[in-house]
Interface confidence: medium
């Protein structure tokens, strides 16, 4: 599908710059750059700058761009499950009297048998089979923390439903904690959501494995359908590779800008709107680090060469097992700009403008 | 960087199949397929099948693979902000007496001035400047729903911090509702999280723009730092294009498998482990829809041709303004498998094995 040539870096940069010229106009749905005839003299109004800065501020709790997947995520995960401790265990006696909560306890020795080392755990899900539900119910999941205290983990709004449905809560961090330093028995609490001004909430949802009284007594369990932890982990015998083998590199600006990597990597490209595009109409910013992806992603013929060295290359050069792997952007970031339409300043956000990392895909 | 050739579809498929052979072994860190000498006869044990099925079950509330971005997301968004109504407004008088909550109201006429149609709104964030915090605080955000009732929206665990920090809550759905059918003034409540068994929580976090009494009375407001809604929307004059122009296609199985698309698209490929790879060692599944991406992503020279027709092509063929756009997987899904190591059955999950959609990147 493609033939190798010596790469003309200048041509690549020119093509990237010209593509960006079209991309920006296209994103703004402009057939040509806007006229600057009516733009008022002087600096941008303070309110416009404040607005522009708001779009640039990172805010607490904002989800950053997806991180490149760590090496461990490429490899297969062994799946096991650990069922909830049956409720004749004395641990449940302490937690019987609540109408707003049910309790689920797990034996940490069973967890450690499945996942001997916390670092091997890739994902843990608490799976509950909720029975049909006639009203909307807002529930919260807590983790048993110290003797009798509970730490909030997450919440879910359960829609009314006419049939049973599996619920899944990601509890990876909690199970990793338990594997490190957990007691003999650890647990979760599923509670009705109570707000500070309405506190008479009852847990309406029925979870398979509990009586409708919701007092923690285990009813008949249909097959394996009582609450369980679904664990995905790197098997112990496969773990030493992760430490010993060279880690899969994140092909990001940190690595690529400071290396002489010939293969797929993010390459530095700063675009100055005035100098590179001949544009004066974008008032802020003056330019930006657009960057681009470049470098080969060799196809690996595994047919006659199934030995460790070749297989190890898949992770870096062709993780998606493509017929023609290609070096493309992985993490992208938006670019806010300020420009004028007539006399009116506008702040606009352009999506996916800055290349932060690349991958072979 | 690449030269055009007639595509040999059979060669592409063969290369994809061979790449998958190496990929699976590589993900399992196997140098060659495992020996089947000790595998017990008969069907798989029921517990193993149940475990395998658990990994295949879609569960309620599980986040599906990221959807391909809708056409509207490609285009620029105009950014505006609407400040919270000042607290001498009578609406605040109804909500003064709580130590666990603060209230923030917004004028819907100002929102409608910024975003005339709900469909134009792409994102709305409630931005709050939280001051330095000395204790961890778990807060909840509510939306004013009917006369005096509040609907839970989201929560955040605020870590202690040595300096002020912007908080952002995604309230796109709520603001879209308000634009459709909101009253004259609508609002949010930020509350301490109260669990059903400990209800004496006080809102410890100070939000800039409120007195320390935290009773909703507005103190002096430092600059523009009182709570505001940051809105990102498609400008009205740009909106008709979205209805009239052909929507950006999702290059997914729904579209690609039922069309004769020559350009970049996901192509159907079922891999039968026995027939295609000569493998008997994977017991479940018998095969899977691996699929692959194929088709040109034409580079568009915009230099001499900045007119609407050419610019419209960017969205489909080169949205990332690449120097050499390439057809690559967008949404991928995992594959669980069951195989034996000696006499022991194993369930393993292989990440990113099934191609659901493609994109030019």
């Amino acid at each position: 599908l493609s033939t190798c040539k010596t790469i003309d870096m200048e041509l690549v940069k020119r093509k990237r710059i010209e593509a960006i010229r079209g991309q920006i106009l296209s994103k703004l749905r402009l057939a040509s750059p806007p006229s600057q005839g009516e733009v008022p003299p002087g600096p941008l109004p303070e309110a416009v700058l404040a607005l522009y800065n708001s779009t640039r501020d990172r805010v607490a709790g904002e989800s950053a761009e997806p991180e490149p997947e760590p090496e461990a995520d490429y490899y297969a995960k062994e799946v096991t499950r650990v069922l909830m401790v049956e409720t004749h265990n004395e641990i449940y006696d302490k937690f019987k009297q609540s109408t707003h909560s049910i309790y689920m306890f797990f034996n940490t020795s069973e967890l450690r048998e499945a996942v001997p080392e916390p670092v091997l755990l890739s994902r843990a899900e608490l799976r509950l089979l909720r029975l049909k539900l006639k009203v909307e119910q807002h529930v919260e999941l807590y983790q048993k923390y110290s003797n009798n205290s509970w730490r909030y983990l997450s919440n879910r709004l359960l829609a009314p439903s006419d049939s049973p449905e599996w619920l899944s809560f990601d509890v990876t961090g909690v199970v990793r904690q338990w594997l490190s330093r957990g007691g003999e028995i650890e647990g979760f609490r599923l509670s009705a959501h109570c707000s500070c001004d309405s506190r008479d909430n009852t847990l309406q949802v029925d979870i398979n494995g509990f009586t409708t009284g919701r007092r923690g007594d285990l009813a008949t369990i249909h097959g394996m359908n009582r609450p369980f932890l679904l664990l995905m982990a790197t098997p112990l015998e496969r773990a030493q590779h992760l430490q010993s083998s060279r880690h899969r590199r994140a092909l990001d600006t940190n690595y690529c800008f400071s290396s002489t990597e010939k293969n797929c990597c993010v390459r530095q490209l700063y675009i100055d709107f005035r100098k590179d595009l001949g544009w004066k109409w974008i008032h802020e910013p003056k330019g930006y680090h657009a960057n681009f992806c470049l470098g080969p992603c060799p196809y690996i013929w595994s047919l006659d060469t199934q030995y460790s060295k070749v297989l190890a290359l898949y992770n870096q050069h062709n993780p998606g097992a493509s017929a023609a792997p290609c070096c493309v952007p992985q993490a992208l970031e938006p670019l806010p700009i300020v420009y004028y339409v007539g006399r009116k300043p506008k702040v606009e956000q352009l999506s996916n403008m800055i290349v932060r990392s690349c991958k072979c895909s | 960087l690449s030269t055009c050739k007639t595509i040999d579809m059979e060669l592409v498929k063969r290369k994809r199949i061979e790449a998958i052979r190496g990929q699976i072994l590589s993900k399992l860190r196997l140098a060659s397929p495992p020996s089947q000498g000790e595998v017990p006869p008969g069907p798989l044990p029921e517990a193993v099948l149940a475990l395998y099925n658990s990994t295949r079950d879609r569960v309620a509330g599980e986040s599906a693979e990221p959807e391909p971005e809708p056409e509207a997301d490609y285009y620029a968004k105009e950014v505006t902000r609407v400040l919270m109504v000042e607290t001498h407004n009578e609406i605040y008088d109804k909500f003064k007496q709580s130590t666990h909550s603060i209230y923030m109201f917004f004028n819907t006429s100002e929102l409608r001035e910024a975003v005339p149609e709900p469909v134009l709104l792409s994102r709305a964030e409630l931005r709050l400047l939280r001051l330095k915090l000395k204790v961890e605080q778990h807060v909840e955000l509510y939306q004013k729903y009917s006369n005096n009732s509040w609907r839970y929206l989201s929560n955040r665990l605020l870590a202690p911090s040595d300096s002020p920090e912007w908080l952002s809550f995604d309230v796109t759905g709520v603001v879209r509702q308000w634009l459709s059918r909101g009253g004259e003034i609508e609002g949010f409540r930020l509350s301490a999280h109260c669990s059903c068994d400990s209800r004496d929580n006080t809102l410890q976090v100070d939000i800039n723009g409120f007195t320390t009494g935290r009773r909703g009375d507005l103190a002096t407001i430092h600059g523009m730092n009182r709570p505001f809604l940051l809105l990102m929307a498609t400008p009205l004059e740009r909106a008709q294009h979205l209805q009239s122009s052909r929507h950006r296609r999702a290059l997914d199985t729904n579209y690609c498998f039922s069309s004769t698309e020559k350009n970049c698209c996901v192509r159907q490929l079922y891999i039968d482990f026995r027939k295609d790879l000569g493998w008997k060692w994977i017991h479940e599944p018998k095969g899977y829809h691996a699929n692959f991406c194929l088709g040109p992503c034409p580079y568009i020279w915009s230099l001499d041709t900045q007119y609407s027709k050419v610019l419209a092509l960017y969205n489909q063929h080169n949205p990332g303004a690449s120097a050499a756009p390439c057809c690559v997987p967008q949404a991928l899904e995992p594959l669980p498998i069951v195989y034996y190591v000696g006499r022991k059955p194993k369930v393993e999950q292989l990440s990113n094995m099934i191609v659901r959609s493609c994109k030019c990147s």
């Epitope: - | 915090l133 300096s163 006080t202 320390t212």
Partner: antibody
Framework: SVEESGGRLVTPGTPLTLTCTVS????????MTWVRQAPGKGLEWIGV?????NTYYANWVNGRFTISKTSTTVDLKITSPTTEDTATYFC???????????????WGPGTLVTVSS | AYDMTQTPASVEVAVGGTVTIKCQAS??????LAWYQQKPGQPPKLLIY???TLASGVSSRFKGSGSGTEFTLTISGVECADAATYYC????????????FGGGTKVEIK
């Protein structure tokens, strides 16, 4: 109440740990600070330890001081004292939940550290 | 940085008079400010916090006001016992801060 101890005459470069012992309240509910005052000078903030254990320091500290705590004590370690560190060192407790701000309403009497060769 | 500048450095006031001490922040700190009184040989004593809230057991002759960057401590009906050094303290940010306290104002009674 809070009381500082451990102040003494030390030579430059000799590490020194001051201890603040608290009674009548739990350190898991209150932020605690260390402040020093050179003879005839004003109050100089060193750092604070929050109830949850987070520590924050003045810009100039630059690793020269470390604050830590146990269930009943808050320690200030001076890693390599210089003559400029000669001062009375105060430990103080935050007002607690009566304000979300960190202000100090219970102070120890102070302990004198003299650094001299 | 959030630097606190106190003025004047010292002031003399007659018994029964009123004294005003100012504290200026280099950037806006909202109302996150406290005032302390310190007498020779003693630790500081909290007078006012959150710019205007009187601490427990403090005389109502002490009044705090201001927000943003300008703050004032006013002592009315001055008594001999008010002779001391007064410090302001910001609690807006610890980041890039050299000192959360102002330089102090010495009040002497005529």
């Amino acid at each position: 109440s809070v009381e500082e101890s451990g102040g003494r005459l030390v030579t430059p470069g000799t590490p020194l740990t001051l201890t603040c012992t608290v009674s009548g309240f739990s350190l898991s509910n209150y932020a605690m600070t260390w402040v020093r005052q050179a003879p005839g000078k004003g109050l100089e903030w060193i750092g604070v330890i929050y109830a949850g254990g987070n520590t924050y320091y003045a810009n100039w500290v630059n690793g020269r001081f470390t604050i830590s705590k146990t269930s009943t004590t808050v320690d200030l370690k001076i890693t390599s004292p210089t003559t400029e560190d000669t001062a009375t060192y105060f430990c103080a407790r935050d007002v607690g939940s009566s304000s979300s701000g960190v202000y100090f309403n219970i102070w120890g009497p102070g302990t004198l550290v003299t650094v001299s060769s | 940085a959030y630097d606190m500048t106190q003025t004047p450095a010292s002031v003399e006031v007659a018994v029964g008079g009123t004294v005003t001490i100012k504290c200026q922040a280099s950037q806006s700190i909202g109302s996150r400010l406290a005032w302390y009184q310190q007498k020779p040989g003693q630790p500081p004593k909290l007078l006012i916090y959150d710019a205007s809230t009187l601490a427990s057991g403090v005389s109502s002759r002490f009044k705090g006001s201001g927000s943003g960057t300008e703050f004032t401590l006013t002592i009315s009906g001055v008594e001999c016992a008010d002779a001391a050094t007064y410090y302001c303290q910001q609690d807006y940010s610890y980041r890039h801060v050299d000192n959360i306290f102002g330089g102090g104002t010495k009040v002497e009674i005529k």
